[in-house]
């Protein structure tokens, strides 16, 4: 009689994580008598997956009634597959004895597990940066299998080319991770911009996963300042305005200085928003020129988002205004954009 053969017809089987894997195995003879065992891997480190004779294998069920005496089908189903189950599975016939001894092995079936990548997480720099600067964004996704994966970067729908991507580990693994770093040059118009990391994988059926980062979290647009003197409101009073334009984020503190001395400090509150997402704000100062004998240097000093202060000055010619006798203090009004003169 021809010697028993162990036939594993499938060289490979691919299963999505969470599904069941069916591993086929038949023998060509009922002799010798003895059980079947299934192993993952070969050599001393192989793992016992199923023993027909004894043991508890909660995730494994036999496809046919392997207890029947004439049964020659020893196929198994493994439920709730995870990437950790990937490997080569061997169906092995044992010869009955004390103990049973290994008789013949099948050629093996390689089980590969398709696992979806996690949602990409995009993170930007820890500190804000100003336009014209280059900033780095990272994108990470984990837990996918097989290893082949495609990652693309976009800024407002335009594909970026300056990025580096690594898939780890380099060798064989149950699942993989991808890490990519993209370089983005900021512009003044980027407050409303988005950086998108897009990951495509065989498990996603052509519907890539996306992770986004808003450049509003990254950019700082410094303000431009303009100090102007308005027409005289009343005799001896001059209205000076400081226009703070095109800044982002909103966090801004303005200080008026008269000849270098602090006159008033205020925080930007009711700002107007521009189409590009930046803000404008205006502050005004009412100066009583009769309180000054000499010309006055008025300075609008702005501290934006914790950065070093920027300032703009305006020289007020006192000689051009008639002085009021007996007055030696400057009467100042607390002005803001809420009570502007327009």
């Amino acid at each position: 009689e021809e010697e028993l053969q162990v036939i594993q017809p499938d060289k490979s089987v691919s299963v999505a994580a969470g599904e069941s894997a069916i591993l086929l195995c038949t023998v060509t003879s009922l002799i010798p008598v003895g059980p079947i065992q299934w192993f993952r891997g070969a050599g001393p480190a192989r793992e016992l997956i199923y023993n027909q004779k004894e043991g508890h294998f909660p995730r494994v069920t036999t496809v046919s009634e392997s207890t029947k005496r004439e049964n020659m089908d020893f196929s198994i189903s493994i439920s709730n597959i995870t990437p950790a189950d990937a490997g080569t599975y061997y169906c092995v016939k044992f010869r009955k004895g004390s103990p049973d001894t290994e008789f013949k092995s099948g050629a093996g079936t390689e089980l590969s597990v398709r696992a979806k990548p996690s949602a990409p997480v995009v993170s930007g720099p820890a500190a804000r940066a100003t336009p014209q600067h280059t900033v780095s964004f990272t994108c990470e996704s984990h837990g996918f299998s097989p290893r082949d994966i495609t990652l693309k970067w976009f800024k407002n729908g335009n594909e970026l080319s300056d990025f580096q991507t690594n898939v780890d580990p380099v060798g064989e693994s149950v699942s993989y991770s991808i890490h990519s770093t993209a370089k983005v040059v900021l512009t003044r118009e980027d407050v409303h911009s988005q950086v998108i990391c897009e990951v495509a994988h065989v498990t996603l059926q052509g519907d890539p996963l996306r992770g986004t980062a808003n450049l509003s979290e990254t950019i700082r647009v410094p303000p431009t300042l303009e100090v102007t003197q308005q027409p005289v409101r009343a005799e001896n009073q001059v209205n000076v305005t400081c226009q703070v334009r095109k800044f982002y984020p909103q966090r801004l503190q303005l200080t008026w200085l008269e000849n270098g001395n602090v006159s008033r400090t205020e925080t930007a509150s009711t700002v107007t928003e521009n189409k590009d997402g930046t803000y404008n704000w205006m502050s005004w100062l009412l100066v009583n020129v009769s309180a000054h004998r000499d010309d006055v240097k008025l300075t609008c000093q702005v501290e934006h988002d914790g950065q070093p202060a920027v300032s703009k000055s305006h020289d007020l010619k006192v000689s051009a205004h008639p002085k009021e006798q007996g007055s030696n203090t400057a009467a100042e009004n607390t002005g803001s954009n809420e009570r502007n003169i327009y």
Partner: antibody, heavy 122, light 107 residues
């Protein structure tokens, strides 16, 4: 009681070969992989390879392929290792140990032979 | 190959002291780690298997644990016979690899 009895100390010339033995007793020889481990003088332990007596299946550490050859005689429950083309680097104590026919935690490298000292000298 | 980095390579301690030896695995080995003890005469004995299971006949002052890829052997209350060499071994995948060893010396 499970025991491994290893052959005695060997003094060998460079370029020659030595064959050492490890006789197992106290359990079923064919249910286990027999492993060999090297320890150079004042050095750590290095796994050489293993053999499965049922079908003479062998697995080697790449570093020892072509240097060590593992065999068994199941009728005497004895594992053998031959180390060839001896150099000073092969001077070491060689141990045998075992693991179950599949990866059973409790059975990995529980029992060890007493070691065979090989000295290579001209 | 999986590298097992064992530290310290040598350790001086006093009787009754508590000491810990560590092995770091370069790849995931799960719980497949043994701790071995080697006497000066070369005799090797397994103390711990599967990271934390104590072999029969091994005193309870020996214990094994894991934190991520770091595996530790702790001896609480050193006795004179404990001042020998210790090795970790990973048996997750071939080639099976050992740590470089720790020589435990008496202060």
């Amino acid at each position: 009681e499970v025991q491994f009895q290893q052959s005695g100390t060997v003094l060998a010339r460079p370029g020659t070969s030595v064959k050492m033995s490890c006789k197992a007793s106290g359990s079923t020889f064919t249910s286990y992989w027999m492993h060999w481990v090297k320890q150079g003088p004042g050095q750590g332990l290095q796994w050489i390879g293993a053999i499965y007596p049922v079908n003479n299946d062998t697995t080697y550490n790449q570093k020892f392929k072509g240097k060590a050859e593992l065999t068994v005689v199941t009728s005497t429950s004895t594992a053998y290792m031959e180390v060839s083309s001896l150099t000073n680097e092969d001077s070491a104590v060689y141990y045998c140990t075992r693991s179950f026919y599949y990866s059973l935690d409790a059975a990995w490298f529980v029992y060890w032979g007493q070691g065979t000292l090989v000295t290579v000298s001209a | 190959d999986i590298q097992m980095t064992q530290s310290p390579s040598s350790l001086s301690a006093s009787l009754g002291e508590r000491v810990s030896l560590t092995c770091r695995a370069s790849q995931d080995i799960g719980s497949r780690l043994n701790w071995l003890q080697q006497e000066p005469d070369g005799t090797i004995k397994r103390l711990i298997y599967a990271t934390s299971s104590l072999d029969s006949g091994v005193p309870k002052r020996f214990s094994g644990s894991r934190s991520g890829s770091d595996y530790s052997l702790t001896i609480s209350g050193l006795e004179s016979e404990d001042f020998v060499d210790y090795y970790c071994l990973q048996y997750a995948s071939s080639p099976f690899t050992f740590g470089g060893g720790t020589k435990l010396e008496i202060n």
